[in-house]
């Protein structure tokens, strides 16, 4: 869509005559009647297929033609085209004399025409005013055309639609070639895309104008870069949303079970060497001189009676000494200075030489020990301790110090490993002679029913058109990270496309 | 008196150039597109080019396109067509004409001869 | 381009009877035709143009008519003057072109 304009200069009739030659009474009030057509290889008398336009009276005889554009006149004369422009044309101006005020064709006499030109034109769209001179032997015009586009039409045949906008269906101004250029923050065809903050990731980030970062459902940061790990993870990080990859020396679902409860919390004393033996569990190798679970306990070396024929034990810094009695000497007063003439059998023993009388050795009646059977038996020695406890005499008792998971006076009793309920998501624990065993519900397995083998949200592939699916593994739900341009819950829904022309 | 008169006809080796002018008077040449027509021996009328008034649009027939050009002087109301690379079949005889058909003008020369022969 | 076809290529009448012939396009030319007549060593001769409008001089004998793609040169009593060749030519777009001619010669 667009206007020919034609600038109408001057005319010269310098005698007032009209085309037969006859003078004008009293002189030739001159108009004027423009038709303009299609381009004719000959030009030929034929419909005005581009418009039709008539002036009023402009003058008398020979005159000058006033521009009024800016005063909302009809000078430059105005031919609106509702086409592609083609480039050239056929023009024809004619110059009629009236007689009185109707200027109707009708109503003038044929012999009232003074002059006709008949053109065939080439004109680009937005040339300069293109001047043309038409002379007769009797007249002669002056008149200049140009073509523009209408408002919001460009292009070199003003037939590209474009009008500026900022609004939901785009922001943009038209360039002089109908092309759109959009305003700044905008992209796309239409310029209805608007360009993130700088940086922000291109799949989990998004934004609804311009310098805005949004992030998508399982990413967070200033840049949507950063994954969310699964809800309730504690000890663990992610690559991919909803993921809880455990720190080194935690472990489970969640990454809330210490598999390194040695380093985490130091359980062992008295310098006691640490062992991880499984979740929340240890082991202590304690120092010589300590025991107890943790090595807390400081163990007394003259517990084990090593003392011999009745020498008494004294405790030491960096050991034991044994003081002997007469008659004994050695580390544990082993060596005897006596003869069977001394009567060294205590408790009814029996004595016997040896060596020739140099030494000798007592039979000890049943419920005595030693080497002078000066020692009630020791109750420890008959290992009454069960499961590897170890026997400790306190003066004329006896107690068991049992391993980890044994109880009992003499650890016979296993302690219940299921006591700590190990088993995770509702598992049934199972006391077995060396530990324990989880019957794990549907949806899960492993030692302790720690592993979720419940079926993945995402198997079914239920997001459309592309989308990543992540399992949120506390509802067994899935969750659809859409591609840009889809919405809805399973990205379903495609965002309305504008159609060509969207104004 | 109208009259368009051409010149510059003649016998041409194939390959060789000519120009051929057409000199108008009694009418206003720079008002009128301008056109040579040519008629070779024993066949009908054939169109050749066109110049528009001012001389801003030209149109040839394909057959001469890139060797005939067609321009005017409207200072010398004279019209031209500069013949490059003859062939025979360009053998026929050349008018100039002035046809305004809505202005009822219809001009046409006299005609002048051109034969290309070896 | 236009192709115009004349038909008859030659036209036999005798003088003072009426003349028909014909010209067709190949594509509608929207009334830009004219018709010549042509005489052996004379310049075309325009007797119609607009396909029906008669030249300035020309006899009223000689009219045109049609429309679209199809014309018609009628001469109502022919004169021994009329017997030549007569061409219609198509002014709608470039190339030009000519029909091919019809004689008309005295039968």
């Known amino acids: 869509s667009g206007v020919f304009q034609l600038q109408l200069q001057e005319f010269i009739n310098e005698r007032g005559v009209l085309a037969s030659g006859r003078p004008c009474e009293p002189g030739c009030r001159t108009f004027f009647r423009v038709c303009l057509k299609h381009f004719q290889a000959v030009v030929s008398p034929g419909p005005c297929t581009f418009g039709t336009v008539s002036t009023p009276v402009l003058g008398t005889n020979s005159f000058a033609v006033r521009d009024d554009s800016s005063g909302g006149g009809r000078n430059p004369l105005q031919l609106p085209f509702n086409f592609t422009w083609p480039g050239t044309f056929s023009l024809i101006i004619e110059a009629w004399h009236a007689p009185g005020d109707d200027l109707r064709p009708e109503a003038l006499p044929p012999d009232a025409l003074i002059s006709k030109i008949a053109i065939q034109g080439s004109l680009a769209v937005g040339q300069n005013w293109l001047l043309d001179e038409q002379t007769s032997t009797l007249t002669r015009l002056r008149y200049s055309y140009r073509v523009i586009c209408s408002d919001n039409y460009y292009g070199d045949n003003c037939s590209r639609l474009c009008k500026k906008r900022n609004d939901h269906f785009g922001h943009y101004v038209c360039q002089p070639d109908g092309n759109l250029s959009c305003l700044p923050g905008w992209t796309g065809e239409y310029c209805q895309q608007p360009i993130c903050l700088s940086g922000c990731h291109e799949q989990n980030g998004y934004c609804s104008k311009p310098a805005e970062c949004l992030c998508r459902p399982g990413w967070q940061g200033r840049l949507c870069n950063e994954c969310i790990p699964h809800n309730g993870c504690r000890h663990g990080t992610c690559s991919t949303p909803w993921q809880c990859t455990c720190d080194e020396g935690w472990g489970g679902l969640f990454c809330d079970q210490d598999l390194n409860y040695c380093t985490h919390h130091s359980p062992c004393k008295n310098g006691a060497t640490c062992s991880n033996s499984g979740q929340r569990s240890y082991t202590c190798t304690c120092r010589p001189g300590y025991t107890g679970v943790d090595c807390e306990l400081e163990l007394s070396e003259c517990d084990s009676n090593p003392c011999r024929n009745g020498g008494s034990c004294k405790d030491q810094e960096d050991g034991y000494h044994c003081l002997c009695p007469p008659g004994y000497y050695g580390l544990h007063c082993e060596h005897s200075t006596l003869s069977c003439a001394d009567s060294p059998c205590f408790n009814g023993g029996s004595c016997r030489e040896r060596n020739q009388g140099a030494n000798y050795a007592c039979e000890c009646p049943p419920n005595f020990t030693g080497s002078n059977c000066e020692k009630k038996v020791d109750r420890c020695t008959s290992n009454p301790c069960a499961n590897g406890g170890q026997c400790l005499n306190r003066g004329p008792s006896r107690m068991c110090r049992c391993r980890p998971g044994f109880t009992g006076t003499y650890c016979e009793l296993h302690v219940s490993d299921c006591a700590r309920n190990p088993c995770a998501h509702g598992g049934t624990c199972h006391d077995l002679e060396n530990g324990l065993m989880c019957t794990c519900p549907a949806g899960f397995s492993g030692r302790r029913c720690e592993v979720r083998t419940s079926i993945d949200a995402c198997a079914s592939s239920p997001c459309f058109n592309r989308a990543t699916c992540y399992t949120d593994l506390s509802t067994d739900t899935f969750v659809c990270n859409c591609p840009y341009g889809f919405v809805g819950s399973r990205c379903e829904f495609p965002v309305g496309l504008p159609p060509s022309f969207p104004w | 008196e109208v009259q368009l008169v051409e010149s510059g006809g003649g016998v041409v080796q194939p390959g060789r150039s000519l120009r051929l002018s057409c000199a108008a008077s009694g009418f206003t040449f720079s008002n009128y597109g301008m056109y040579w027509v040519r008629q070779a021996p024993g066949k009908g009328l054939e169109w050749v080019a066109f110049?528009?008034?001012?001389?801003?649009?030209?149109y040839y027939r394909d057959s001469v396109k890139g060797r005939f050009t067609i321009s005017r002087d409207n200072s010398k109301n004279t019209l031209y067509l500069q013949m490059n690379s003859l062939r025979a079949e360009d053998t026929a005889v050349y008018y100039c004409?002035?046809?305004?058909?809505?202005?009822?003008?219809?001009?046409w020369g006299q005609g002048t001869m051109v034969t290309v022969s070896s | 381009e236009i192709v115009m076809t004349q038909s008859p290529a030659t036209l036999s009448v005798s003088p003072g009877e009426r003349a028909t012939l014909s010209c067709r396009a190949s594509?509608?030319?929207?009334?830009?035709l004219a018709w010549y007549q042509k005489k052996p060593g004379q310049s075309p001769r325009l007797l119609i143009y607009a396909a029906n409008r008669l030249q300035d001089g020309v006899p009223a004998r000689f009219s045109g008519s049609g429309s679209g793609t199809e014309y018609t040169l009628t001469i109502s009593s022919l004169q021994s003057e009329d017997f030549a060749v007569y061409f219609c030519?198509?002014?709608?777009?470039?190339?030009?072109?000519f029909g091919q001619g019809t004689k008309l010669e005295i039968k």
């Open positions: 110049i528009s008034h001012g001389g801003g649009i030209t």
């Open positions: 594509e509608d030319i929207y009334s830009n």
């Open positions: 004409a002035a046809l305004n058909w809505e202005l009822g003008i219809d001009y």
């Open positions: 030519l198509q002014g709608s777009k470039f190339p030009l072109t």
